[in-house]
Interface confidence: low
């Protein structure tokens, strides 16, 4: 029987870049307010965007149910097209892979088709990014 004590467990270094953020509210013509529920994430949120430090492919999962119909896009760099875009939906449950690089920032843009500018409430709003190329170029 083999016992590992805490000091003997080999560290996984560097840890895989990943983050899970939640969002409960989106602002029309703007984005969704994202928060990271865990302090232990290896990626960070800054100015309502997820900061990319490592080049490579990322698994991206996006889920949520919206209080009204909206169009939602997920961007990674100003002046570039969206990672993906959904038009006139009340829910999203999508998964995909995209190549991202150091200095990219992942953020939302949301527009609704109603005349009111009230916030859109979100239930079960979750965005997950998981880096698929550990050992690749990273800058911190």
């Amino acid at each position: 029987c083999l016992h590992f004590y805490a000091s003997q467990v080999p560290p996984q270094y560097p840890p895989i870049q990943s983050i899970r953020v939640q969002f409960t509210r989106c602002e029309n013509e703007k984005g969704c307010i994202i928060t990271s529920p865990s302090k232990d994430e290896t990626m960070k949120v800054q100015d309502n965007s997820i900061i990319i430090n490592c080049d490579g492919f990322y698994l991206i999962s996006l889920k949520g149910y919206f209080s009204e119909e909206l169009s939602l896009s997920l961007y990674y760099r100003k002046g570039r097209g969206p990672l993906f875009s959904l038009s006139k939906v009340t829910s999203v449950d999508s998964i995909g892979v995209a190549y991202l690089a150091f200095k990219d920032k992942v953020y939302f843009n949301v527009t609704t088709h109603s005349t009111s500018y009230k916030d859109i409430q979100v239930n079960g709003g979750e965005l997950i990014l998981i880096h698929q190329n550990p050992g690749g170029f990273c800058a911190y």
């Epitope: 409960t24 889920k63 149910y65 209080s67 449950d93 916030d119 409430q121 239930n123 079960g124």
Partner: antibody, heavy 116, light 112 residues
Framework: AVQLVESGGDLVRPGGSLRLSCVAS????????MYWVRQAPGRGLQWVAT????????YSTDTVRGRFTISRDNARNTVYLQMNSLRVEDTAVFYC????FGLGYWGQGTLVTVSS | DIFMAQTPPSLSVSPRETASISCKAS???????????LDWYLQKPGQSPQLLIY???NRFPGVSDRFSGSGSGTGFTLRISRVEASDTGVYYC????????TFSQGTKLEIK
């Protein structure tokens, strides 16, 4: 299509136990808080119990607390209601329902009859 | 607990007329998150309840635009315009602002 299918309802003696199950399909079950709501014959709707989307938080109405336990298995897309020490006044159709903002998805209900 | 009082208990309306149902809460349903968790449900004879309106005025997907909700704080109204025979059933309001989730006693709508 969204579907919630309840089962487990039966005729039981006062003091007896039953376990209701509700299997969900057609939506992301693990994103939804799940509720059990009951309706006594010819009466209105009464909330019974709630379990949060992750299963960490459970709530129940005063009249069933300590007797009924709500649980869920997100891997099986199933929510349960374990009912112990059943009383005649627990006789009702029990509905399982998923809450997004309102209780948007409902099952067909399962009848629990408590009688001696 | 928040008590939900609904009026009238029953209502008889001719086809193509408008029906109004009122719901009053014993305390404000405005949640600290800024939402008002007031829902309207219809239970047709022999069927499970179905959600019509959530967050006071938002129609659930697939619900006819003949159904509309309004109100704030403690007073809310469901309006059904151009009533049809298929609207027959019992209408309930429910609040999810504070546990326990509570329902009204219902309004039975009959089409003449």
């Amino acid at each position: 299509a969204v579907q919630l299918v309840e089962s487990g309802g039966d005729l039981v003696r006062p003091g007896g136990s039953l376990r209701l199950s509700c299997v969900a399909s057609g939506f992301t079950f693990s994103n939804f808080d799940m509720y059990w709501v009951r309706q006594a014959p010819g009466r209105g709707l009464q909330w019974v119990a709630t379990i949060s989307y992750d299963g960490f938080n459970t709530y129940s109405t005063d009249t069933v607390r300590g007797r009924f336990t709500i649980s869920r298995d997100n891997a099986r897309n199933t929510v349960y209601l374990q009912m112990n020490s059943l009383r005649v006044e627990d006789t009702a159709v029990f509905y399982c329902t998923a809450r997004r903002f309102g209780l948007g998805y409902w099952g067909q209900g399962t009848l629990v009859t408590v009688s001696s | 607990d928040i008590f939900m009082a609904q009026t009238p208990p029953s209502l008889s309306v001719s086809p193509r007329e408008t029906a109004s149902i009122s719901c009053k809460a014993s305390q404000s349903l405005l949640h600290s998150d800024g939402n008002t968790y007031l829902d309207w449900y219809l239970q047709k004879p022999g069927q499970s309840p179905q959600l019509l309106i959530y967050l006071v005025s938002n129609r659930f997907p697939g619900v006819s635009d003949r159904f509309s909700g309004s109100g704030s704080g403690t007073g809310f109204t469901l309006r059904i315009s151009r009533v049809e025979a298929s609207d027959t059933g019992v209408y309930y309001c429910g609040q999810g602002t504070q546990l326990p989730y509570t329902f009204s006693q219902g309004t039975k709508l009959e089409i003449k």
